[in-house]
């Protein structure tokens, strides 16, 4: 008789999830000498232990604590780039500007980027059919709790000038309900962070508006100022040129506004 299986609203665990996590870990530790001591099998065991045999709506930060310890890694705290709704450009930027880091440039962020995972209560099976959706099912699911945990702690590590890349093409350039708006903003440490600098990325080629005057950016400024952190904002009118100028800063066309 087939066992009854909970049907969730979200997509199931990414296929070949264990193999993907293990392979990513091996690749990361090979590329980053400071992480060569990491035992990737132990990392996978800790990752698996966070959600296997547990109800996928009842996951806690504590479940991920063994994984967090195994993935301990310091990042230059004044070289942190946060992002919201513009992941690809943020990652393209840090691939060129190698001394800056997004969360996905760290071991744990790299392992989990773009993956989905969940288990089932009281069985050692991974659920490849469906996983809880944050809105439709529950917020304390394995994926959401993981990202909330690492995002909070990444923001807590930041210092001096912290940068955030925001998507100027969206109706809410700053969204209070995004991970940046709901977690990272509130976990920047005022005693360590002097300034949050927002980079608003324009979408349209002919868009010359000052999106730093957008009401949602003003809302972000207000939240940040109340936390005794200074705020600054820059328009990136041409993201393609922006990336090009990061690659080749000596280019004569890079002295003008981008």
């Amino acid at each position: 008789v087939p066992r009854w299986r909970q049907q969730w609203s979200g997509p199931g665990t990414t296929k070949r999830f264990p193999e993907t996590v293990l392979a990513r870990c091996v690749k990361y530790t090979e590329i980053h000498p400071e992480m060569r001591h990491v035992d990737c099998q132990s990392v996978w065991d800790a990752f698996k232990g966070a959600f296997i045999s547990k109800h996928p709506c009842n996951i806690t930060e504590e479940d991920y604590q063994p994984l967090m310890k195994l993935g301990t890694q310091t990042v230059p705290c004044n070289k942190i780039l946060l992002w919201s709704r513009i992941k690809d450009l943020a990652h393209q930027f840090t691939q060129v500007q190698r001394d800056m880091f997004t969360l996905e440039d760290t071991l744990l962020g790299y392992l989990a980027d773009d993956l989905t995972w969940c288990g089932e209560f009281n069985t050692s099976k991974i659920n490849y059919q469906s996983c809880p959706d944050w809105r439709k099912d529950c917020s304390n699911n394995p994926v959401s709790v993981f990202w909330k945990t690492v995002s909070r702690r990444f923001a807590e590590a930041a210092c001096d000038v912290v940068h955030v890349m925001l998507n100027g093409s969206r109706s809410k350039i700053f969204d209070k309900n995004s991970t940046f708006g709901s977690v990272e903003v509130h976990n920047l440490q005022p005693e360590k962070v002097q300034t949050l600098e927002a980079w608003v990325i324009h979408g349209g080629r002919e868009d010359s508006r000052d999106l730093c005057q957008d009401p949602t950016i003003k809302e972000l400024e207000s939240i940040i100022s109340k936390r005794n952190i200074q705020f600054s904002c820059k328009n990136i009118y041409r993201p393609d040129k922006f990336l090009q100028c990061v690659k080749n800063p000596e280019d004569s066309s890079c002295t003008s506004e981008i």
Partner: nanobody, 117 residues
């Protein structure tokens, strides 16, 4: 692997001085925020002082004017000079790098400071 080792603790009379040192390996003190925390018996761990790569320095109100945090990039150490010590400064002093919780931070094992009256 990030490791922090504290030294310099001990027993001192009220009004005396001590210099704590924290040696880091596996990470650079010049690129991370470095902090000293302390924990007295039966109390929560509390921030004493911190320094960032941009030399943003913060002290807890209870040590202002008495303690000085500094960094020695060449030796990869962070130091805490403690003057005019008081009995209430008695605690285990811990060195911290980065965040207070893993994965983006690490702690030393701590060094005991005892101030007798």
């Amino acid at each position: 692997q990030v490791q922090l080792v504290e030294s310099g603790g001990g027993l001192v009379q009220a009004g005396g001085s001590l210099r704590l040192s924290c040696a880091a390996s596996g990470s650079s003190v010049s690129m991370n925020s470095m902090a000293w925390y302390r924990q007295a018996p039966g109390k929560q761990r509390e921030l004493v002082a911190l320094i960032t790569p941009g030399d943003r320095i913060n002290y807890a109100d209870f040590v202002k004017g008495r303690f000085t945090i500094s960094r020695d990039n060449a030796k990869n150490t962070v130091n805490l000079q403690m003057n005019n010590l008081k009995p209430e400064d008695t605690a285990v002093y811990y060195c911290n790098i980065g965040a207070t919780r893993p994965p983006f931070g690490a702690w030393g094992q701590g060094t005991q400071v005892t101030v007798s009256s």
